[in-house]
Structures are given as structure tokens and as C-alpha cells.
């Protein structure tokens, strides 16, 4: 088994106020086994914003189909962007157990809020 | 409450073809991946074939491979799995069950009983 | 294929463990309870641990290396079944079950 590696490929991402934000993130392996979870934010103040074990998350969708077997996918749209919502979001791969317990995270994708056009 | 009720169970003999659907209701059908499994009389159960939400994507037993095809309609909550080159082990209950974000199974039909017999 | 005991045994209010090995660390194991043949499976335990929302609490599971456990504290008389394990692998994309374990409740 090929070295997890987490590829968020974007530093950054600018969305007006209103709008919907695309954040990228893809896997290279299955394994080990567990869940993505997204964060906006690091350390214990971090906020959850998708965990693909759990839901509903109102206003994230993913943007690939999570339902296939074989998915590495895990982009996500996080509609209705308000101020509130800037930060710097992490992908991050946890492995399974009693809890699950993080394995690896992305460099992370830093969303800014335009003002809403006039 | 999540349902699902499965038809198109029958005697047919061995050589032909048959169609079984599951009818979904109580959840969203089209943000689930779906499958089949069966259960020939006295035995244990067996993982038939799995789809994705979309339907995009399909999945196989090395037992039906070849002879049978699953797929969805999402504008009509139903589920398919078509057989074909019937044979006596084909003989089971077959169910289709909701997978969970692992692609194990939270719910499961009543089942319908194909008999393949000359 | 996993591997489950054929049959286990116990008087009311005992705990009963029954554990299922083979799935090797890629998997996610659960639990499927069928009172009578040919019925409808009940989920009991699905993602290792994860007990439905209308599932009683004196089922629970586990999962360590390759094994799952799955434990019934307190058993019942209505408990009588077949339990069946199930796994998902990653490496092949496949569902696989246990030939099932027969509980009997003296």
C-alpha cells in the first residue's frame, strides 16, 4: 500500500459574500481505513465542518460522489458564504477505532469573503 | 420511517431471465448507495451487488458477474437487479438493503423469494 | 471469509459474546440479527461500534486488529437468533458475511 498523501491543491480561495466556495481535496490511497473530516481552523478551538460518517451538514455538499467504493474525492461546496465563514480549512484522514484517531491532514485552503456585489 | 419493499420474485427454470425491484421510501433515495443480498434456503446470507447514489457505478459477486445487472431509477426511488442464465443457486430470498457511508447496511427489506427449478 | 462461531448459548441476564475474525484491518465489520429464516436482517451494530438509534443498548460492538465482537449484556429470551457478521474490504470493494452464529437462550 502506496504512503497516504492528502492534496489540497489550492493556498487559497476568494468567494463574495452570498456566493457558494469549492474547497479541493483528494486522497492517493484508501488506507488506512477511516473517514474525512473537514475543519475550519487547527487545535482544540477548530470547528467541524463535513464528516463523511456523520450528517447532515445544512450547507456542505460534496462535490464528487462519496458513494463510490473506489472514491478519493472528498471537494466539497460550502454554500451561502457569509464573513463568518473565513479561515483556513483542513482535510484531514482519521483512522478508524474506538475513537477514530487523526492520521493526516492537508496544507489546508485559506477562504476569504469578498463583499457582496452591489 | 425508512422502507423498502421488494418485488418481482417468481419460479422461473433454469436458463431465464428475471427482474427484481426495490421500492424506496422514508429517506432520499438518491444520496444513497444501494445493494442486493441474498439468502439461498438453509444457508447463510450473501453479498449480491452494490451501486452508487448515482447510479454510476456498479459493483459484483464473482457468483452473478456477468449474468446480472443492478441499477437505479432516482425519479422513482427504485432499485433493479436483473438475472439472467438462471440457475438452481440463484434459489434464495433476496434482499435489498441501504448502505451506510462504509458500505455496510443500516436497512433492510421484507425480501422476495426467487425459485429456479424445472 | 470471516470466521463466527456456529453456535453459542446462554441463560437469561448473562452477557454473550460473539466474535468474528478474517476481515484483516481493511474492513469495517457489523452485526445482523435474523430471528427466523428468510425474514428481514436487523442491523444491530454497523461501522464496528455504530448501534442504530432503535436498537436496544445492551448490544454493543467492538473491533481490535482484525476481530469484531459483538456483546450482549443481559440477554433475553427474544434475543434468540442468528447473528450474522458482516465486513466491508477496501482492497477489494467486496461484502462479505459469516456463515452466522445461532444463540440460544436456556
Known amino acids: 500500500e502506496e504512503e497516504l498523501q492528502i492534496i489540497q491543491p489550492d493556498k487559497s480561495v476568494s468567494v463574495a459574500a452570498g456566493e457558494s466556495a469549492i474547497l479541493h481535496c483528494t486522497i492517493t490511497s484508501l488506507f488506512p481505513v477511516g473517514p474525512i473530516q473537514w475543519f475550519r481552523g487547527a487545535g482544540p478551538a477548530r470547528v467541524l465542518i463535513y464528516n463523511q460518517r456523520q450528517g447532515p451538514f445544512p450547507r456542505v455538499t460534496t462535490v464528487s460522489e462519496t458513494t463510490k467504493r473506489e472514491n478519493m474525492d472528498f471537494s466539497i461546496s460550502i454554500s451561502n458564504i457569509t464573513p463568518a465563514d473565513a479561515g483556513t480549512y483542513y482535510c484531514i484522514k482519521f483512522r478508524k477505532g474506538s475513537p477514530d484517531t487523526e492520521f493526516k491532514s492537508g496544507a489546508g485552503t485559506e477562504l476569504s469573503v469578498r463583499a457582496k456585489p452591489s | 420511517d425508512v422502507q423498502l419493499v421488494e418485488s418481482g420474485g417468481a419460479v422461473v427454470r433454469p436458463g431465464e431471465t428475471l427482474r427484481l425491484s426495490c421500492t424506496a421510501s422514508?429517506?432520499?433515495?438518491?444520496?444513497?448507495?444501494m445493494s442486493w443480498v441474498r439468502q439461498a434456503p438453509g444457508k447463510g446470507l450473501e453479498w449480491v451487488s452494490g451501486i452508487s447514489a448515482s447510479g454510476s457505478d456498479t459493483y459484483y459477486a464473482d457468483s452473478v458477474k456477468g449474468r446480472s445487472t443492478i441499477s437505479r431509477d432516482n425519479s422513482k426511488n427504485t432499485l433493479y437487479l436483473r438475472m439472467s442464465s438462471l440457475t438452481a443457486e440463484d434459489t434464495a430470498v433476496y434482499y435489498c438493503a441501504r448502505e451506510t457511508w462504509n458500505h455496510l447496511f443500516d436497512y433492510w427489506g421484507l425480501g422476495t423469494l426467487v425459485t429456479v427449478s424445472s | 471469509a470471516l470466521t463466527q462461531p456456529a453456535s453459542v448459548s446462554a441463560n437469561p441476564g448473562e452477557t454473550v459474546k460473539i466474535t468474528c475474525s478474517g476481515g484483516?484491518?481493511?474492513?469495517?465489520y457489523g452485526w445482523y440479527q435474523q430471528k427466523s429464516p428468510g425474514s428481514a436482517p436487523v442491523t444491530l451494530i454497523h461501522s464496528d461500534d455504530k448501534r442504530p438509534s432503535d436498537i436496544p443498548s445492551r448490544f454493543s460492538g467492538s473491533a481490535s486488529g482484525s476481530t469484531a465482537t459483538l456483546t450482549i449484556t443481559g440477554v433475553q429470551v427474544e434475543d434468540e437468533a442468528v447473528y450474522y457478521c458482516g465486513g466491508y474490504d477496501y482492497t477489494t470493494y467486496v461484502n462479505t458475511f459469516g456463515a452466522g452464529t445461532t444463540l440460544t437462550v436456556l
Open positions: 484483516g484491518t481493511s474492513s469495517y
Open positions: 422514508g429517506f432520499t433515495f438518491s444520496s444513497y448507495a
